[in-house]
């Protein structure tokens, strides 16, 4: 008789999750030779230990501490790019501008990007059928707690000028409920971070509005200023040209506003 299994509202663990995490870890050490001695089996064991045999609505940041310790990585603190609701462009940017880093350019972010996982209380099984949805089921689920933990640590590590890419096509360009708005903004350290510079990415080709004047951007500016961090904002009117100019800054067309 099959054992009764909790049905959650979200999709189940990504298929071949253990193999995917291990393979990504090995690939990361190949791409980033400064991490060439990382023991990926130890990393996987710590990852697994954070959620296996635990109730998937009862996960804490403490559960992920062993993994956080193993994944400790020195990223240049003045080269951090945060993003909200515009992941693909942020990643395209750091692929070109190799000295800048998003969270997903770090080992732990790279391991978990776009994956889902959860276990079951009192069994060593991974649940491939369903996992808790943040809204419909619970917020303290393995995936949400992981991203909250790594995002907090990433923001805490930042210094000097921190950049954030925001999606100007959304109704809330800055969303207080996003990971950026709820975690990263509040964990930037005022004694280390001088300025948060927002890059608002325009979607429409003919969109010439100054989205830095958007009420949600003004709200972000207010939050940041209250934290004794300076705020600046730039419109990126042409993201395609923006990327092209990052690739070829000498191009004559790159002196005008992008």
């Amino acid at each position: 008789v099959p054992r009764w299994r909790q049905q959650w509202s979200g999709p189940g663990t990504t298929k071949r999750f253990p193999e995917t995490v291990l393979a990504r870890c090995v690939k990361y050490t190949e791409i980033h030779p400064e991490m060439r001695h990382v023991d990926c089996q130890s990393v996987w064991d710590a990852f697994k230990g954070a959620f296996i045999s635990k109730h998937p609505c009862n996960i804490t940041e403490e559960d992920y501490q062993p993994l956080m310790k193993l994944g400790t990585q020195t990223v240049p603190c003045n080269k951090i790019l945060l993003w909200s609701r515009i992941k693909d462009l942020a990643h395209q940017f750091t692929q070109v501008q190799r000295d800048m880093f998003t969270l997903e350019d770090t080992l732990l972010g790279y391991l978990a990007d776009d994956l889902t996982w959860c276990g079951e209380f009192n069994t060593s099984k991974i649940n491939y059928q369903s996992c808790p949805d943040w809204r419909k089921d619970c917020s303290n689920n393995p995936v949400s707690v992981f991203w909250k933990t790594v995002s907090r640590r990433f923001a805490e590590a930042a210094c000097d000028v921190v950049h954030v890419m925001l999606n100007g096509s959304r109704s809330k360009i800055f969303d207080k409920n996003s990971t950026f708005g709820s975690v990263e903004v509040h964990n930037l350290q005022p004694e280390k971070v001088q300025t948060l510079e927002a890059w608002v990415i325009h979607g429409g080709r003919e969109d010439s509005r100054d989205l830095c004047q958007d009420p949600t951007i003004k709200e972000l500016e207010s939050i940041i200023s209250k934290r004794n961090i300076q705020f600046s904002c730039k419109n990126i009117y042409r993201p395609d040209k923006f990327l092209q100019c990052v690739k070829n800054p000498e191009d004559s067309s790159c002196t005008s506003e992008i």
Epitope: V26, D39, T72
Partner: antibody, heavy 120, light 110 residues
Framework: EVQLLESGGGFVQPGGSLRLSCAAS????????MNWVRQAPGKGLEWVGI????????YYADSVKGRFTISRDNSKNTLYLQMSSLRAEDTAIYYC???????????????WGQGTTVTV | QSVLTQPSSASGTPGQRVTISCSGG????????VYWYQQLPGTAPKLLIY???QRPSGVPDRFSGSKSGTSASLAISGLQSEDEADYYC???????????FGGGTKLTVL
Amino acid sequence: EVQLLESGGGFVQPGGSLRLSCAASGFNFNNAWMNWVRQAPGKGLEWVGIINGDGTNTYYADSVKGRFTISRDNSKNTLYLQMSSLRAEDTAIYYCARDNKLNDYYYAMDVWGQGTTVTV
Amino acid sequence: QSVLTQPSSASGTPGQRVTISCSGGSSNIHANYVYWYQQLPGTAPKLLIYRNSQRPSGVPDRFSGSKSGTSASLAISGLQSEDEADYYCGTWDNILNVWVFGGGTKLTVL
């Protein structure tokens, strides 16, 4: 045959400078991360620092940071250790050692030179 | 004071099995692969074990390495007089961003 051969050791006054060389042969030097490791008389191994294949990345032990500089000339298959502001405690045998890469895996310090002695 | 802790000495009689321990922390041994080096008297160190438990070609299978959590160990079975040497463990430290060695263990074959 894979070989590393250090040279440039000798006697130097405290506060003085010295440049050690490590000539590599028998392998693709351009791709190899290269280490300097030292051993004071009667003591254990102490890692000094490392440089990546194209010379753009270096890491140093705290004890030598700001005083020692690791560089390389890939056209000459040679690794260097420029030592300045030398102290008595820098007296040691200095070894160069290769980090190898095989099948996308790295192997730390799989080949060592015979060492060169520095006396301060 | 080394970041990795090894016993300063170990001994055994020919044919015996001896184990040398190496203890560290979560940012070095636990996170990264452990390597072991053998230094015979008056010679340069030689790689003995890489990636926790792998042996380079030419190293006898009497030498074996293992790792568990923040500790690693080197086992030598069927001890021979030519095994008399100093043994060092080593690994990268992700927080210090440096390579760290243990203080070394002098193995005496009685």
